[in-house]
Interface confidence: low
């Protein structure tokens, strides 16, 4: 960007611009209009001769000169104002913007230039003088003015000199210009180098991330089996208990068989006398299958079953179809309890949701939906939802009617696009909608302008991403 | 329909002050998120502003933090554009738009007005 | 700041032709771009958001492409009509960042 341009304005005026980032400095140079060309009749360096001219001829010589004088003090004049005044805006903007090199120069070539315009005046000044005293007394000093208008040519030729020094100077300024572009760009170059190394470090820290996040996921796993190699023990002892206390009741009429109890959800739990927070093994409506779940005894009246908990970003949640299906995390964390699980529950029975959520302020608010129910896998666990009150949003954050659910591997929006993929996580997305609370974890300060993050729009508005969520369902007749 | 009517544009010195105005019909205005997008003669479009629908979120860009403010008034469905030490370099058309809910749009402006000229010149 | 660098500043095509107009992201934005058009006179309108996605009532002769940092857009068998300018923005943070226009003109 740095550049000089030298051209010619409309009126004739030599112009010099140098540009240089933001600054532009512009030498107009009035160009000698009345100075004659080489081609014109009379040569401003001809020898002189001795011999005495005519009158006449002597006259019409120094008027001649005379105008030639008067012209160039003309010229010198208008030079010397243009150089003032733009000298005064000129400094104002060097000092302002340009380099402390390029302001030292600036300054001296300005002081230069007006030492150099005073001097040239004052010599003038005097020549002017003399040629004046000299037309009075042309008769008698005819051999004596030969000599004087030798000396104002030649003083001529030296102010032509002086021109051509100060454009000397204007080239020595461009070299000086053009030289620092090209140490800008020699920086520049090595900034984009800079750069481009700590991209390479940063795509290495990424790989580095995505490794320990498998092994996190791989130690997820084998947590996971380790507790149900505990559960299955747990349930081995509970038989050889059971098979014991057959026995025994068999030879002793008295004692009572032991039933086992199941519950089916946190408030069977609750009213079963259990209203200590924690986990809890549930089991799937007329199955004996089980799935273990966290209980919130406290919020609310208790009995709540939670379905979905984000708190510090500990769990991917950009998970499958299937893993979204059968539950996925650790209960008294971060985990989805599963799809089908919710699915089957929420069809037996009239169920509310709670979804809790916390900003990275220290604000809370909550949505509460009356009804709350989601399809079979065959109708891709579609939410259900109705009466929504609460502080987050008079509006419903999942769209309404209720949509799909989609994943990565399951794309069941109504966008073009594949939204799972795109903000992350599965969620019932719409064409994407104004909610994901499975979306991308986001740390303190970097939770802003991001719109694959944890989303509840109609309490934060667009790409906030909130610091914890906590969904929640309990039976409506609780 | 969807429809944003700006006003408040006209003449300003350098210094100066002058508040636009832009109001909204056609959907729930405090629903959305709201922004200011400006053009200069002849240039390309610059974003300015952004409020979000509870005013809750505002953002500002570089060159006009601290000098301009934004603020709606959403029973009245009304965005606005306070503009104070104004520069010649603040002459342009002033659009405001609505952003879309869409999550996938992000800060998708779907919605624009027909913008209000303000010229800043002594 | 995220800069989007659009090329080219303005093109000449004959109607029916296709052009394709890109749009350079500093650094990446996934696919969280859009596209607008901008007739003299008149406010700008979105053609196309999430970088591939087509706004309500554009025709289906606009298509968009790419993530990351590289994005087009691509007009198909040119219209009177489409001989206007184009803008891209990045949708991805504040502040919001916009193309300095494409200027499409008839041959």
């Known amino acids: 960007y740095n550049n000089f341009r030298k051209s010619m304005d409309s009126i004739g005026k030599k112009q010099y611009q140098v540009q240089h980032g933001s600054c532009s400095y512009t030498f107009l140079l009035p160009e000698m209009d009345n100075c004659r060309s080489s081609s014109s009749p009379y040569v401003s360096n001809a020898v002189q001769r001795d011999a005495p001219l005519e009158y006449d001829d002597s006259v019409q010589r120094l008027q001649v000169l005379e105008n030639i004088m008067e012209n160039n003090t003309q010229w010198l004049m208008k030079l010397e104002n243009y150089i003032q005044d733009n000298m005064k805006k000129e400094m104002v903007e060097i000092q302002q913007n340009a380099v402390q090199n390029q302001t030292a120069v600036m300054i001296e070539i300005g002081t230069n230039l007006l030492n150099q315009t005073a001097e040239q005046t004052r010599k003038l000044t005097d020549v002017e003088a003399q040629v004046l005293n000299q037309t009075t007394r042309l008769e008698l000093q005819l051999l004596e003015h030969s000599l004087s208008t030798n000396k104002l040519e030649k003083q001529i030729l030296d102010q032509t000199s002086e021109i051509n020094k100060l454009q000397d100077k204007n080239s020595f300024l461009e070299k000086k210009v053009l030289a620092m572009e090209d140490k800008h760009i020699i920086q520049l170059q090595s900034i984009k180098e800079e750069k481009d190394q700590l991209q390479v470090l940063v795509s290495k820290q990424n790989s580095i991330i995505e490794e320990l996040e498998k092994k996190i996921v791989t130690a997820t796993v084998n947590n996971s089996v380790l507790q149900k190699q505990q559960h299955d023990l747990m349930e081995t002892v509970n038989n050889l208990l059971t098979m014991m206390s057959t026995s025994n009741s068999a030879k002793d009429p008295t004692v009572a068989k032991e039933e086992q109890i199941s519950f089916r959800d946190c408030a069977e739990v609750f009213k079963s006398g259990h209203t200590t927070n924690g986990i809890y093994t549930l089991t799937f409506p007329n199955s004996t299958e089980e799935i273990k779940a966290y209980c919130d005894m406290e919020a609310g009246g208790g009995g709540w079953t939670i379905i979905q908990r984000r708190e510090d970003g500990s769990v991917d949640f950009q998970r499958t179809w299937k893993e979204y299906k059968v539950g996925f995390g650790n209960p008294s964390g971060e985990y989805w309890l599963g799809n089908e699980f919710v699915s089957q529950l929420t069809n037996q029975q009239r169920y509310v949701l709670k979804i809790h959520l916390k900003d990275w302020e220290g604000n809370e608010a909550y949505s509460l939906y009356e009804h709350f129910y989601l399809s079979s896998e065959e109708l891709n666990y579609r939410i259900h939802l109705k009466g929504l009150t609460g502080t987050a949003g008079k509006i419903s954050s999942i769209s309404q009617p209720g949509n799909d659910f989609s994943t990565k591997d399951g794309d069941n929006d109504k966008c073009i696009c594949k939204c799972s993929q795109m903000l992350t996580g599965g969620w019932w997305f719409d064409a994407c909608g104004p909610s994901n609370l499975n979306g991308m974890y986001y740390p303190q300060r970097q939770n802003t302008n991001k719109f694959n993050g944890i989303k509840w729009y109609y309490w934060k508005g667009s790409g906030y991403s909130l610091k914890a969520t906590t969904m929640m369902i309990r039976p409506a007749d609780f | 329909d969807v429809q944003l009517v700006e006003s408040g544009g006209g003449l300003a010195q350098p210094g100066g002050s002058r508040k636009l105005s832009c109001a909204a019909s056609?959907?729930?205005?405090?629903?959305?998120?709201m922004h200011w997008v400006r053009q200069a003669p002849e240039k390309g479009l610059d974003w300015v502003a952004y409020?979000?629908?509870?005013?809750?979120?505002?953002y500002y860009a570089d060159t006009v933090k601290g000098r301009f403010t934004i603020s709606r008034d959403n029973p009245k469905n009304t965005l606005f554009l306070q503009m104070t030490s104004l520069r010649s370099e603040d002459t342009a058309m002033y659009y405001c738009?609505?952003?879309?809910?869409?999550?996938?749009?992000?800060?998708?402006?779907?919605?624009w007005g027909q913008g209000t000229s303000v010229t800043v010149s002594s | 700041d995220i800069q989007m660098t659009q090329s080219p500043a303005s093109q000449s095509a004959s109607l029916g032709e296709s052009v394709t107009i890109t749009c350079l992201a500093s650094?990446?934005?996934g696919t969280w771009l859009a596209w607008y058009q901008q007739k003299p006179g008149k406010s700008p309108q979105l053609?196309?958001?999430?970088?591939?996605s087509l706004a309500d009532g554009v025709p289906s002769r606009f298509s968009g492409s790419g993530s990351g940092t590289k994005f087009s857009l691509k007009i198909s068998s040119l219209q009177a009509e489409d001989f206007v300018s184009y803008y891209c923005?990045?949708?991805?943070?504040?502040?919001?960042?916009i193309g300095a226009g494409t200027k499409l003109e008839l041959k």
């Open positions: 409020i979000s629908s509870g005013s809750d979120t505002i």
């Open positions: 053609l196309i958001y999430a970088a591939t």
């Open positions: 650094q990446t934005i």
């Open positions: 738009a609505r952003e879309s809910t869409m999550i996938t749009m992000g800060y998708v402006l779907d919605y």
């Open positions: 056609g959907f729930t205005f405090s629903n959305f998120g």
């Open positions: 923005q990045q949708l991805y943070s504040i502040p919001l960042t």
